[in-house]
C-alpha cells in the first residue's frame, strides 16, 4: 500500500492533466482527490501514466468505490482496465455496450481472458439477457469471447439471436456450452431447407443428441471430418457403420486418419469387425465375428 503523506501546497491537484506524470507515487496518493479523479476519468487515458502511477489511481478509485465502480467511471477506464482483476470486475454493473467495446479494445493483445470473461458476464447480467446487440458486439470486437460465458449465462440467448453467431465464434466452446446453444440453433434454423440448414447448424453440432445425428445421416449432408470429430462421444457411439458412411459420404476415408482418436476410436470398438471391413479402410479393433454384444446399460435401466 502507498504511504499516506500530506500534499505539498504547490502540488495540489485541481484537474487531471499531463502535469501529473511528473508526480511520484506518494505525491499522487496524497494530492489527487478520488472524487476529482472519478469526475475526470475521461482525461486519464490520454495521459501517459506509468504502470506504477496507474496502480495509485486504481487504489484511489477502490477506496472511493469499495462496492464497485459506477459505469460512468468504468466507461473511461482505458488502460487502467489492464490493472483490474476479475474480483474487481465482479463488483461492477455494466449495461452499456459502448463501455464493453471500449474495454474490449483496450484488452486486445494483453493476457486478460479471465478479466474479459468476467466483464462480459457482468454485461449480460446488467442487460438481463444476451441480446442481439450484445452478441453483435462480442462477435465484432472479441471473436471467441462468446465461449467464455458460462452455460447459465448462455441460456439467456434468445433463439432469434443465434443467426448472428458465426462459426469462428464457437471454436473455443466446450460441450456444456454447445449443449445450451445447439437446441436454440435447431429452433432458430428449423424453417430452412436441408442443405441450408446443415450449413447453419454445423458449428453447433457438438451439442447434438444421437437422434439428430442419425437424422442427418439420412440427408446426404457429407459431414466433414472436423465436424464429426467434434460430435459428442455419446452421440457417435450408437451410430451403425452404415449410418456413419451415409453421414460422412466421401469424407468417410478420413476415419482411417482419425482411427486412434476419440470419438472414432471408441466408435470402432463398438462395431462388428465385419461391418467395419465393408468400408474398405482397414479399420481395426472392432468386435470379432461370433461374439455376442450385450448392452448392459439398457439392462440396468430396465432392472
Amino acid at each position: 500500500d502507498v504511504e499516506r503523506t500530506t500534499c505539498p501546497p504547490e502540488k495540489e491537484v485541481h484537474e487531471i492533466d499531463e502535469s501529473l506524470i511528473f508526480y511520484k507515487k506518494r505525491e499522487l496518493e496524497a494530492c489527487v482527490d478520488a472524487a476529482l479523479l472519478a469526475a475526470q476519468m475521461d482525461r486519464v487515458d490520454a495521459i501517459p501514466f506509468t504502470y506504477e502511477q496507474l496502480d495509485v489511481l486504481k487504489h484511489k478509485l477502490d477506496e472511493l468505490y469499495p462496492q464497485g465502480y459506477p459505469e460512468s467511471v468504468i466507461r473511461h477506464l482505458g488502460h487502467l482496465f489492464l490493472k483490474m482483476s476479475p474480483e474487481d470486475i465482479r463488483k461492477w454493473n455494466v449495461t452499456s455496450l459502448e463501455t464493453l467495446k471500449a474495454l474490449l479494445k483496450v484488452s486486445k493483445g494483453h493476457e486478460m481472458s479471465a478479466q474479459v470473461a468476467t466483464l462480459i458476464d457482468r454485461v449480460v447480467v446488467g442487460r438481463g439477457q444476451l441480446d442481439k446487440d450484445t452478441v453483435d458486439t462480442l462477435t465484432a470486437f472479441c471473436p471467441g469471447c462468446l465461449c467464455s460465458l458460462s452455460p447459465e449465462r448462455l441460456s439467456s440467448v434468445p433463439p432469434s439471436v443465434i443467426g448472428a453467431v458465426r462459426p469462428q465464434d464457437l471454436d473455443t466452446c466446450g460441450p456444456r456450452q454447445l449443449d445450451v446453444l445447439y437446441p436454440k440453433a435447431r429452433l432458430a434454423f428449423q424453417n430452412m431447407s436441408g442443405s441450408e440448414y446443415f450449413v447453419k447448424i454445423r458449428p453447433f453440432l457438438g451439442g447434438a443428441p444421437t437422434e439428430d445425428v442419425k437424422a442427418l445421416s439420412q440427408q446426404n449432408v457429407s459431414m466433414d471430418l472436423a465436424t464429426f470429430m467434434k460430435l459428442r462421444r455419446e452421440a457417435v457411439l450408437p451410430l451403425t457403420v452404415a449410418e456413419v458412411q451415409k453421414l460422412l459420404g466421401p469424407h468417410v476415408e478420413g476415419l482411417k486418419v482419425e482411427e486412434q482418436h476419440s470419438p472414432v476410436r471408441d466408435w470402432i470398438l463398438k462395431q462388428r469387425q465385419d461391418d467395419l471391413d465393408t468400408l474398405g479402410l482397414g479399420l481395426q479393433g472392432g468386435i470379432p465375428n461370433g461374439y455376442l454384444i450385450l448392452d448392459l446399460s439398457v439392462r440396468e435401466a430396465l432392472s
Epitope: 433463439p159 445450451v180 451439442g207 443428441p209 437422434e211
Partner: antibody
C-alpha cells in the same frame, strides 16, 4: 420399445416442493431431449421445460423461478422439482420425449408417460 | 409467448361425417405446429407435425393444413374412436405452447 413412467407423491402440501421422477426404459436417455408437461384437471396442457442428458435445461418463463429439472443417466431417469406449490399447481404431470430429429426439426412430443396426478392440499 | 386459440371449444359431429377443427396463433409460427389427440384418462397422442405431416401409425383420415397463423385439422370420416379432445401446439419458439383444446363429441 421405449416407455416412460412417472413416479412421486400424489399429495403435496401448499408451500412445499413437488418432486417427480420419470424413468426411461427400453432405450438410452442420451439420445433425445426429455420434457415435463402438466395438465390441470379439466384444462389444457402446459409445457414446463426440457432437459438434455448432460444436464442442460430450458424452462417455461412462467415457472422458471420455481422449477429444477435434473437427470441421472446411470438410472436412465430425469426429475422435476417444483417449489412453493399452491393449489394452482394441482395437475396431471406427464413426462414426454421430444422427437429430436433434424429431418423434422421440431420441439413436439412423440412419446408420453401415462401421467401422475399431483394434488396440492393441506 | 405465443398464444394458441382453438375453435370451437366443443364440436358435435355424427360418426361417418367430416370434422374440421381450427387453431390460430397470436403470431406466425410458420409450419411449426403439431396436433395431438387425448382420450379421458390417457396421455396425449401425436397425430400431425409440421402442420401437415402425419405421425407414424396415424390413419389417413386425419389431415392437417395451414401455415403462419391459421391451421386446420380435418378428420374426413369420423370413427367412434376419434371422439376425444384435440390440442394444437406451436414449436416455432419457446416457451412451447398449446391451445386450450377442442372437444369432439358424438352428435
Amino acid at each position: 420399445q421405449v416407455q416412460l413412467q412417472e413416479s412421486g407423491p400424489g399429495l403435496v402440501k401448499p408451500s412445499e416442493t413437488l418432486s417427480l421422477t420419470c424413468t426411461v426404459s427400453g432405450g438410452s436417455i442420451q439420445n433425445y431431449y426429455w420434457s415435463w408437461v402438466r395438465q390441470p384437471p379439466g384444462k389444457g396442457l402446459e409445457w414446463i421445460g426440457y432437459i438434455f442428458y448432460s444436464g442442460s435445461t430450458n424452462a417455461n418463463p412462467s415457472l422458471k423461478s420455481r422449477v429444477i429439472i435434473s437427470v441421472d443417466t446411470s438410472k436412465n431417469q430425469f426429475s422435476l422439482k417444483l417449489s412453493s406449490v399452491t393449489a394452482a399447481d394441482t395437475a396431471v404431470y406427464y413426462c414426454a420425449r421430444e422427437v429430436g430429429r433434424i429431418a423434422v426439426a421440431g420441439w413436439f412430443f412423440d412419446l408420453w408417460g401415462r401421467g401422475t396426478l399431483v394434488t396440492v392440499s393441506s | 409467448e405465443i398464444v394458441m386459440t382453438q375453435s370451437p371449444a366443443t364440436l358435435s359431429v355424427s360418426p361417418g361425417e367430416r370434422a374440421t377443427l381450427s387453431c390460430r396463433a397470436s403470431q406466425s409460427v410458420n409450419a411449426n405446429l403439431a396436433w395431438y389427440q387425448q382420450k379421458p384418462g390417457q396421455a396425449p397422442r401425436l397425430l400431425i407435425y409440421g402442420a401437415s405431416t402425419r405421425a407414424t401409425g396415424i390413419p389417413a383420415r386425419f389431415s392437417g393444413s395451414g401455415s403462419g397463423t391459421e391451421f386446420t385439422l380435418t378428420i374426413s370420416s369420423l370413427q367412434s374412436e376419434d371422439f376425444a379432445v384435440y390440442y394444437c401446439q406451436q414449436y416455432n419458439n419457446w416457451p412451447l405452447t398449446f391451445g386450450q383444446g377442442t372437444r369432439l363429441e358424438i352428435k
